[in-house]
């Protein structure tokens, strides 16, 4: 899964459905797989925020051991801390579980910065605020790690929700969601509503706050407004999609659309930022700078290295442009666009300036591994991972942060030709996709 500004995410926890709530619109939608409507038991089952990740409570073993697990759509292993670590409040103790089975196999996962390694086994797993089922799932018991767990993050493991192709050590290790669908009647679909707080949260606020919802097996209509628009999953490894056009404040970046997907575009809840390929990043920043030229900010800000601070409540949102990504639609020559606000791509950072200041980090960054639609994108939307129909749906999130002038948007259809040409075909080599 992409590291660097990639998982583990950095900075604090929490994030509640705050800011202005949009009115509910009633739109009819095509029939969805699985249950629809209300999933009261699963709503608000996530805590966290974009900087350090969103986590769900899970239980592992018999008797059940409760752990907080980071929800990561950019990887495919279920891995939990299984040995003492200075940043862990608790960890999985295999010796205390009567249902643990050792697979007698190790696993090693390196990142650009850091790594984790552990021992593979299986055990009984359930999600208290999820479907009322228990499954036997593969678990990587992390025995050693470096720069993986985050001090104060409050999560002890990671739930990789992507496909088997990118599982470690290889694709024969069945991911948790595959096991869940195989062993139960849970439909092959999940949806995520990640709620950015819009302002920094201290540790106590985080632990008391709601960070969003992971609806397993369906779609909850209370979590979004307007219509769901779907884009095909190009290939089942990461949740790969195709971006066909990018606009900054309505101005087309006018790049060959292949550049937007070089070498792939993925939806990844385990990445903090919107990460863009080098050429696209440079063009986007140039355009954002031009749009916000009534002020000038240091280069370090655009590199995500420096924070810009304004007196509390005076952040000039209006000088920053909206960013629209056009995604391939389900119908030939049809696309739709998702639009995010500066409230999504300027990430509030706690604890740095005075209490009378609001400080932000620019949460768009450069990537050498393609576009990564991370938490800053996902915080604007309710995102449906419809694995059964090999598609991803986007609708405006009921908890996204906005102001009285602009809101995030999902709009379409738009006529776009030759969208298939926007996909990049990665040369088939046995390279490690995780070493990024």
């Amino acid at each position: 899964t992409q590291h660097g500004i990639r998982l583990p995410l950095r900075s604090g926890l929490g994030g509640a459905p705050l800011g202005l709530r949009l009115p509910r619109e009633t739109d009819e939608e095509p029939e969805e797989p699985g249950r629809r409507g209300s999933f009261v038991e699963m709503v608000d089952n996530l805590r966290g925020k974009s900087g350090q990740g969103y986590y769900v409570e899970m239980t592992v073993g018999s008797p059940p051991q409760t752990l907080n697990i980071l929800v990561d759509t950019g990887s495919s292993n279920f891995a939990v801390g299984a040995a003492p670590h200075p940043f862990l409040h608790r960890y999985y103790q295999r010796q205390l579980s009567s249902t643990y089975r050792d697979l007698r196999k190790g696993v090693y996962v390196p990142y650009t910065q850091g790594k984790w390694e552990g021992e593979l086994g299986t055990d009984l797993v359930s999600i208290p605020h999820g479907p009322n089922v228990t499954v036997r799932a593969n678990i990587a018991a992390i025995t050693e790690s470096d720069k993986f767990f985050i001090n104060g993050s409050n999560w002890e493991g990671i739930l990789g929700l992507a496909y088997a192709e990118i599982a470690r050590p290889d694709d024969s290790l069945e991911p948790f969601f595959d096991s869940l669908v195989k062993q139960t009647h849970v439909p092959n679909l999940f949806s995520l509503q990640l709620c950015g707080a819009g302002f920094p949260l201290n540790q106590s606020e985080v632990l008391a706050s709601v960070g969003g919802s992971m609806i397993i097996g369906g779609i909850d209509h209370s979590l979004y407004t307007g219509s769901l628009w779907y884009t095909p999953i190009r290939r089942e490894w990461y949740y790969e999609v195709i971006i066909v056009r990018v606009e900054i404040n309505g101005q087309d970046l006018k790049m060959d659309c292949k550049e937007y997907n070089y070498d792939k575009s993925i939806v990844d809840s385990g990445t903090t930022n919107l990460r863009l390929p080098k050429k696209v990043f440079e063009a986007a920043v140039k355009s954002i700078k031009a749009a916000s030229s009534t002020e000038k900010f240091p280069d370090g800000f655009w590199l995500g290295e420096q924070l810009v601070c304004w007196q509390a409540g005076t952040t000039p949102w209006n000088i920053f442009p909206v960013i629209s990504l056009y995604l391939m639609g389900e119908v030939t020559n049809q696309s739709f666009r998702i639009t995010i606000l500066p409230q999504q791509y300027l990430r509030p950072v706690e604890d740095v300036a005075t209490s009378q200041d609001d400080c932000y980090k620019f949460a768009i960054s450069q990537s050498s591994t393609g576009t990564v639609m991370g938490a800053v994108i996902m915080e604007g939307f309710y995102v449906v991972f419809d694995r059964a129909r090999k598609r991803i749906g986007f609708a405006v999130s009921a908890c996204h942060v906005h102001d009285e002038f602009r809101t995030a948007a999902v709009e379409g259809p738009f006529v776009t030709l030759d969208m298939e040409d926007c996909g990049y075909n990665i040369p088939q080599t046995d390279e490690s996709t995780l070493m990024t």
Partner: antibody, heavy 120, light 108 residues
Framework: QLQLQESGPGLVKPSETLSLTCTVS??????????WSWIRQPPGKGLEWIGS???????YYNPSLKSRVTISVDTSKNQFSLKLSSVTAADTAVYYC????????????WGRGTLVTVSS | EIVLTQSPATLSLSPGERATLSCRAS??????LAWYQQKPGQAPRLLIY???KRATGIPARFSGSGSGTDFTLTISSLEPEDFAVYYC??????????FGGGTKVEIK
């Protein structure tokens, strides 16, 4: 060679408004991508940032002084100004104007400073 | 709020000696830190920026090091004109505003 020069009264009565002007010579405020700042230093003490302004008129102020400070720019005169209202003896200081350069991060050019005493 | 603490408050040295001044930030400021020199009756002068880069016209005897929370200004061999007050300033949080309390380098 760009130079900065502060000007204004050296004595201000308590509760009145302190007004200073910084004249930029050797270059144009309107065409340069710098922020222009005011910094003060009470006698025998350290440096305190008051605020900064961009050519567009966008300002940033020290939160502790915000309610009393106004910084403005006059590009036609190549000047920027400081007004500090309701002054007390605690506002007695040497007031410097400075340019924020080096990637708009650091105060790379300073005026000589002007001592303003608040006294009745 | 990021607080910059300079130490020692006063450093008594003789010309030709090496001076080592410390600036500690209450949390990481990456490498966004500068050092200024101020002589009596004069405005401060930028010496070092981005923790280790010398400003234009600054002699090579001045060097800066450090990143994160701990920074050092070193004057390899003190000249008579180096006796002054030195301030550090962080700009991890922008706009630039936070200065340390200063270190006075005086003749022993």
């Amino acid at each position: 060679q760009l130079q900065l020069q502060e000007s204004g009264p050296g004595l201000v009565k308590p509760s009145e408004t302190l007004s200073l002007t910084c004249t930029v010579s050797g270059g144009s405020i309107s065409w340069s991508s710098y922020y222009w700042s005011w910094i003060r230093q009470p006698p025998g003490k350290g440096l305190e940032w008051i605020g900064s302004i961009y050519r567009s008129g966008r300002t940033y102020y020290n939160p502790s002084l915000k309610s009393r400070v106004t910084i403005s720019v006059d590009t036609s005169k190549n000047q920027f100004s400081l007004k500090l209202s309701s002054v007390t003896a605690a506002d007695t200081a040497v007031y410097y104007c400075a340019r924020v350069g080096h990637g708009i991060n650091y105060f790379d050019l300073w005026g000589r400073g002007t001592l303003v005493t608040v006294s009745s | 709020e990021i607080v910059l603490t300079q130490s020692p408050a006063t450093l008594s040295l003789s010309p030709g000696e090496r001076a080592t001044l410390s600036c500690r930030a209450s949390r990481s400021v990456n490498s966004y830190l500068a050092w200024y020199q101020q002589k009596p009756g004069q405005a401060p002068r930028l010496l070092i920026y981005d923790a280790s880069k010398r400003a234009t016209g600054i002699p090579a005897r001045f060097s800066g090091s450090g990143s994160g929370t701990d920074f050092t200004l070193t004057i390899s061999s003190l000249e008579p004109e180096d006796f002054a007050v030195y301030y550090c300033q962080q700009v991890y949080t922008w706009p630039p505003r936070t200065f340390g309390g200063g270190t006075k380098v005086e003749i022993k």
